[in-house]
């Protein structure tokens, strides 16, 4: 029950996170005009990954797409790439995790397969979240660098009476959305990985060894299997394999530790 809840919660958290990553990627407010030097401007500038916008006090907003690919800064291209990779991985992760959910029955899919899929989706969510966090952080770092560079420029070369106020940009809403969304996706991924461990408890699999005690004989098989009392009195025919002991009539089959490699 706890495993199902953990898996379900991980899925929901990741879903919200990926929706947030998509929203952040599409948002225009990655950087917004810093109004510290000119708080009474009638024109407000903000920029996204795909276009830059100008909002006038009148309510009119004009946006222009970045129609060049080669003319854009390499950092911006890198941020775009990270966000897109994050979305793609997240989307694939969601698709995989839907089939991995314990509460959803698909044919005669074994729990071992569900555990593998849960782990796969969890890893995908973790990488997706890291991509988003990295992308947003790279952009934020770029903003901070440009902010201080433009601040330095603002106070140099003002010999005359005329002031040329350089537009400085600060953190936009999309950055915070991206950070939170990336974090949620990461948390969701970790939860999926934890759920995977619950779906497939790791076993220590050895060959069954018989210990002969004087008088009353007990065949002890380590690894969580029932020890059958009475030497040679096994009514069930137990086959023993190298790499993992499983009975023919076991209803639930667990993956061995080698399945994770």
């Amino acid at each position: 029950m706890a495993v199902t809840a953990c898996q379900g919660l991980g899925f929901v958290v990741s879903l919200i996170g990926i929706a947030g990553i998509i929203a952040a990627t599409c948002m225009d407010q990655w950087s917004t005009q810093d109004l510290y030097n000119n708080p009474v401007t009638a024109v407000f500038n903000y920029q996204g990954l795909w276009r830059s916008c100008v909002r006038e006090s009148s309510g009119f907003t004009e946006c222009r797409g970045y129609f060049t690919l080669l003319g854009l800064p390499a950092m911006l291209q890198a941020v775009r790439a990270l966000m897109i990779v994050g979305i793609v991985l997240g989307a694939i992760g969601l698709l995989v995790s839907i089939f991995a959910l314990k509460c959803i029955r698909i044919g005669s899919m074994e729990d071992s397969a569900k555990a593998n899929m849960t782990l796969t989706s969890g890893i995908m969510f973790i990488v997706s979240g890291l991509c988003a966090i990295a992308g947003v952080s790279v952009f934020a770092n770029m903003l901070v660098t440009n902010f201080w560079m433009s601040t330095a420029n603002m106070y140099t070369g003002m010999g005359g009476m005329v002031q040329t106020v350089q537009t400085r940009y600060t953190f936009g809403a999309a950055l915070f959305v991206g950070w939170v969304a990336g974090g949620l996706t990461l948390i969701g991924g970790v939860m999926m990985c934890i759920a995977c461990r619950g779906l497939a408890p790791e076993e220590t699999n050895y060959k069954a060894v018989s210990y002969h005690a004087s008088g009353h004989s007990v065949a002890y098989k380590p690894g969580g299997f029932k020890a059958s009392t009475g030497f040679g009195s096994n009514t069930k025919n137990k086959k023993i394999y190298d790499g993992g002991a499983r009975t023919e009539d076991e209803v639930q089959s667990y993956p061995s530790k080698h399945d994770y490699v």
């Epitope: 024109v43 100008v54 309510g59 005329v162 537009t167």
Partner: antibody
């Protein structure tokens, strides 16, 4: 067609307050902003303030303490209220429609004289 | 506040001549986001309200004759009337509409000989 018409008291005693109404037609106050501008006799234009479609306002910092602009969208009316009038507030008061921060249509103006 | 300085304050010219008047702002009116200069030119004829001539420093308002041309960027702007006509007798004002308060220049009075 777009029209703006100012109506005011004409004569105001010093230290009294001034109320001017700008009645608009041909456009909606929910879509356009309205500016107020005044012009003392024989002098240049002075921007007083603006009310935007959302109802938010911006004022001339020199007059902010005694100036108030409001509107009634349903009646298509914009109101200018100015307190503590002095003789140098004597001017022609205009309202004008905003278009992308420029004033494209102006009213004919209303003359206000501050005198005892 | 942004200070708008117009020159000359008055100008006496003959019909048919080319007229140039300038407007300087104490701060740049160029918005980097859309590369537009938020400067407007108005014409005010005697006894009339002002009339919008040019916005964004160089965009002519519809219905305005093409003899009126606005140019300039940043802090220095010019209004040119290519072939002056008798009906152009007026006062011309430039206005900052980039930063509050929206300040006007003192005007250039155009008189015809």
């Amino acid at each position: 067609q777009v029209q703006l018409k100012e109506s005011g008291p004409g004569l105001v005693a010093p230290s009294q307050s001034l109320s001017i109404t700008c009645t608009v037609s041909g456009f909606s106050l929910t879509s356009y902003g309205v500016h107020w501008v005044r012009q003392p006799p024989g002098k240049g234009l002075e921007w007083l303030g603006v009310i935007w479609p959302g109802g938010n306002t911006n004022y001339n910092s020199a007059l902010m303490s005694r100036l108030s602009i409001s509107k009634d969208n349903s009646k298509s009316q914009v109101f200018l209220k100015m307190n503590s009038l002095q003789t140098d507030d004597t001017a022609m008061y205009y309202c004008a429609r905003d278009r992308r921060l420029a004033m494209d249509y102006w009213g004919q103006g209303t003359s206000v004289t501050v005198s005892s | 506040d942004i200070v708008m300085t117009q020159s000359p304050s008055s100008l006496t010219v003959t019909a048919g001549e080319k007229v140039t008047m300038t407007c300087k702002s104490s701060q740049s009116l160029l918005n980097s986001g859309n590369q537009k200069n938020y400067l407007t030119w108005y014409q005010q004829k005697p006894g009339q309200p002002p009339k919008l001539l040019i916005y964004w420093a160089s965009t002519r308002e519809s219905g305005v004759p093409d003899r009126f041309t606005g140019s300039g960027s940043g802090t220095d702007f010019t209004l040119t009337i290519s072939i002056l006509q008798a009906e152009d007798l007026a006062v011309y004002y430039c206005q900052n509409d980039y930063s509050y308060p929206f300040t006007f220049g003192s005007g250039t009075k155009l008189e015809i000989k």
